[in-house]
Amino acid sequence: YDFTNCDFQKIEADYLRTISKDLITYMSGTKSTDFNNTVSCSNRPHCLTEIQSLTFNPTPRCASLAKEMFARKTKATLALWCPGYSETQINATQAMKKRRKRKVTTNKCLEQVSQLLGLWRRFIRTLLKKQ
């Protein structure tokens, strides 16, 4: 999906209002410095591409993030503010249901959510401090 035509201001507002709090709750008890940055993004559409990938694509060591509250709200936000997004996700959602696994908050999941927080922070920081 090409995130170029999303309403970035509305997505940012949703993130600040709800998604960020759910991510922080998930990370509770973990310091942000516990994990190094292993993923970045270079503009707002790119950030959303990487956020979608980390949130919804199961990995061998962290398969359950898509069922978390922050993931559900992320999905709703993207569906609301990115034209045509929900249509592209129907097949992906059906495939995900077949691979559901037992919910365990592993250290790898914490690391992945830490990376997500970093990507969202880059998304809402539209410009560097200086040019």
């Epitope: 993923v39 970045s40 270079s42 560097l128 401090k129």
Partner: antibody, heavy 122, light 108 residues
Framework: QMQLVESGGGVVQPGRSLRLSCAAS????????MHWVRQAPGKGLEWVAV????????HYADSVKGRFTITRDNSKNTLNLQMNSLRAEDTAVYYC???????????????WGQGTMVTVSS | SYVLTQPPSVSVAPGQTARITCGGN??????VHWYQQKPGQAPVLVVY???DRPSWIPERFSGSNSGNTATLTISRGEAGDEADYYC???????????FGGGTKLTVL
Amino acid sequence: QMQLVESGGGVVQPGRSLRLSCAASGFTFRTYGMHWVRQAPGKGLEWVAVVWYDGSYTHYADSVKGRFTITRDNSKNTLNLQMNSLRAEDTAVYYCARSPQWEEIFEAMDIWGQGTMVTVSS
Amino acid sequence: SYVLTQPPSVSVAPGQTARITCGGNNIGSKSVHWYQQKPGQAPVLVVYDDSDRPSWIPERFSGSNSGNTATLTISRGEAGDEADYYCQIWDSSSSLVVFGGGTKLTVL
């Protein structure tokens, strides 16, 4: 563990070519800008080139423009530097380094490789 | 093109504060990064975006930037801080990375 490992250095005659490679692991390579930086024996750091996270743009130092080409293969997590028409003054340790970028702005180089030595001598 | 000027050497007594400067035209309008390089080793990022510090770098390292000078400050200097230090910026006008010439820090 995040790591960059350079290879391909060696001794080469002036006017000849050499190709350096940098293998990345432990991070999502496709999301970072990648640089080559060199250091001549006993001298300071000299930036050589940078390639955008998606390979769409490249920028070069004036001293290597037209002779060196930086490329990346995001499917293989590798960065390359093709060096043509080598000169004695290209003798240096060559480092690859990653940096986040925001639009056309490159940020600090937070991960560096250990370097590979290139000697240009007849 | 843009030029960054550093003193070739700076000395500090153990336990004292070392300040390494990096001069450039209106450098305060740019983000400055600092690297430490020990002999035979690759550079290590110690301060980025003027004053931010990677999580693995001790709080003794700090930075500031305004006007025509950026400064790396190393408090409570230790023998292990002996190294070359380089400032660096991204020059948007020319799309080039620029490094300072480097400063050799000696802990007396």
